[in-house]
């Protein structure tokens, strides 16, 4: 297993509709054809997997049907979007990238993006 640098923004504020987007960029040492991206959430010293997708370079990311994540790839960048977020989902979202094929296997873990989510205050409700 070889180490790889992964960069992601330090802070992102979710929209009033509970959507947060950020870019996860990795420094690919070679020409990977198969990449796996995993989003982890760290809060209260617990780490949980939020979503994961494997994609072939040049193709779309495919998350599971019931995933709260969507994404697109462009070169060594992955644009990730997480939906359905509310205040209790505030936390550090860590991007983990694995170059699966061809060998050698590379692993990179970002420092995390702190996503802040604010629940709407009581007001005549529109679609938050």
């Amino acid at each position: 297993c070889k180490a790889m640098h992964v960069a992601q923004p330090a802070v992102v504020l979710a929209s009033s509709r509970g959507i947060a987007s950020f870019v996860c960029e990795y420094a690919s040492p070679g020409k990977a054809t198969e990449v796996r991206v995993t989003v982890l959430r760290q809060a209260d010293s617990q780490v949980t997997e939020v979503c994961a997708a494997t994609y072939m370079m040049g193709n779309e990311l495919t998350f599971l049907d019931d995933s709260i994540c969507t994404g697109t790839s462009s070169g060594n960048q992955v644009n990730l979007t997480i939906q359905g977020l509310r205040a209790m989902d505030t936390g550090l979202y860590i991007c983990k990238v694995e170059l699966m094929y061809p060998p050698p296997y590379y692993l990179g873990i970002g420092n995390g993006t702190q996503i802040y989510v604010i629940d709407p205050e009581p007001c005549p409700d529109s679609d938050f």
Partner: antibody
């Protein structure tokens, strides 16, 4: 095991207020949102509002804005729903239901409901 | 305000039948939709969340599909205990509106 236990049935006169409680047990109270949903006799489900027991913040359906107040007491793991200026159309069964944050592992929304509280508004 | 419209409002089917209930939403909600079953005199029970995830303990004859504005609840082999009213609901963002319900009767 998870339980949401609501207060007993109430009979109120038009113009009065009612306060219904929902006591939680078997899970971390402040880790789940709580909703209030009502159902008039023979009618469908109607969402009233949501409260974050951790912060106390709440959001209400437009229909109930100005008439409903949702509060919580973290010391007793209880949420309250107060509806004021009652009218006959408010006669319904009122339910509380819990809702985890979307990133909670194996968390499903509205997975546990209280048994319901019948509120009758009659002169 | 967001609107959820279920169809049909009521239907009658026989034991063993395949039943489909649809829910149309007035705006794109991605996959953030729940389905419930409420038997007469009982509290609502969650069947499906996030459009297609089967809630723990719910029989596999129930399935959900759809995304955006059009969603479907399917019961592959209707059972007598499925006599109930079924509701869809938008979730994870206020207002958490319910559909008007679909009353399912057993022939």
């Amino acid at each position: 095991q998870v339980q949401l236990v609501q207060s007993g049935a109430e009979v109120k006169k038009p113009g009065a207020s009612v306060k219904v409680s929902c006591k939680s047990s078997g899970y971390t109270f402040t880790s789940y949102y709580m909703h209030w949903v009502r159902q008039a006799p023979g009618q469908g489900l109607e969402w009233m509002g949501i409260i974050n027991p951790s912060s106390g913040g709440s959001t209400y359906a437009q229909k109930f804005q100005g008439r409903v107040t949702m509060t919580r007491d973290t010391s007793t793991s209880t949420v309250y729903m107060e509806l004021s200026v009652l009218r006959s159309e408010d006669t319904a069964v009122y339910y509380c239901a819990r809702d985890p944050p979307i990133t909670m592992v194996r968390g499903a929304p509205f997975d546990y409901w209280g048994q319901g509280t019948l509120v009758t508004v009659s002169s | 305000d967001i609107q959820l419209t279920q169809s049909p409002s009521s239907l009658s089917a026989s034991v063993g039948d395949r039943v489909t209930i649809t829910c149309r939403v007035s705006q794109d909600i991605s996959r953030l939709l729940n389905w419930y079953r409420q038997k007469p005199g009982e509290i609502p029970k969650l069947l499906i969340y996030r459009a297609s995830s089967l809630q723990s303990g719910v029989p596999s004859r129930f399935s959900g599909s759809g995304s955006g504005t059009d969603f479907t609840l399917t019961i592959t082999s209707l059972q007598p205990e499925d006599l109930a009213t079924y509701y869809c609901q938008r979730t994870y963002s206020a207002p958490y509106t319910f559909g008007q319900g679909t009353k399912l009767e057993i022939k």
